[in-house]
Amino acid sequence: LTCLGGFASPGPVPPSTALRELIEELVNITQNQKAPLCNGSMVWSINLTAGMYCAALESLINVSGCSAIEKTQRMLSGFCPHKVSAGQFSSLHVRDTKIEVAQFVKDLLLHLKKLFREGQFN
């Protein structure tokens, strides 16, 4: 992940920049949340461990018609080395637990801020 092409990016983006931009977008989503995010859609919870970017994308890609998270979906695809499509699931999903998109975003944001603080950009 040393050459991440961010959304509308003119060229390769350092991992630290890509992660910071993802955090900025998640902050923006939580800040501007007036009505229930994505009409209260539910997604599979994930284990926030190695491979979580693909797992997060696999969860969020199943939410359709929600413009608020489209940029996040595109950004996450830059962190995931393989193509992700709707209906795809990895072992990182907690398959018996569904949570609201808003909670999913909050949990992901909290974890990414921790990674950023610790310098874990990949």
């Epitope: 920049t17 910071r20 902050v27 939580t30 801020k113 950023f116 603080r117």
Partner: antibody, heavy 121, light 107 residues
Framework: EVQLVESGGGLVKPGGSLRLSCAAS????????MNWVRQAPGKGLEWVSY????????YYADSVKGRFTISRDNAKNSLYLQMNSLRAEDTAVYYC??????????????WGQGTMVTVSS | DIQMTQSPSSLSASVGDRVTFTCRAS??????LGWYQQKPGKAPKRLIY???SLQSGVPSRFSGSGSGTEFTLTISSLQPEDFATYYC?????????FGPGTKVDIR
Amino acid sequence: EVQLVESGGGLVKPGGSLRLSCAASGFTFSSYSMNWVRQAPGKGLEWVSYISTSNSYIYYADSVKGRFTISRDNAKNSLYLQMNSLRAEDTAVYYCARDQVGATLDAFDIWGQGTMVTVSS
Amino acid sequence: DIQMTQSPSSLSASVGDRVTFTCRASQDITDDLGWYQQKPGKAPKRLIYAASSLQSGVPSRFSGSGSGTEFTLTISSLQPEDFATYYCLQHNSYPFTFGPGTKVDIR
């Protein structure tokens, strides 16, 4: 040396305008979100505005929304605050402070020395 | 908006005293909190980041603790240069908010 230096303060009449600048040096300015914070004479600190690294996300305190505009020029390592429709209650020392989306050890770690804005007729 | 309250608002202490300030947030801010020292006519100086991490170059007599909604700043042995006003800042969500400050003066 990591440094932020504000300028542009002064005396202005109510309803007037002023543009503050903050010149950054000693660090990669484009990698940091930036903020303006103010302090009225004898009062506490009040956050004014935030701008993300690439200008994508901007936030304001309710007290200045619609009157103040934050901007940055990464090529010039500079942060700006355009202040319009100034009121007496905007009288304060204005500081710029660097940040990294509240995510890191760099959040609000470096501050400028401040520039005084006085709004009075 | 997240409200920050600080107690006490002021305190008188002597050199060598152990002093503790409290900062409370109106909602959970995880550890997105910093502590700042400000002396008259000067810019704030950060002492603690991420609620409990000591800023580089800051003496070890300063320490921070807490997470969620309740936070403390402790000076283990007050020095003459520590007489100042101390502010907490939450940078968890916008608008960022400062506590009203705690002024420490000489008893």
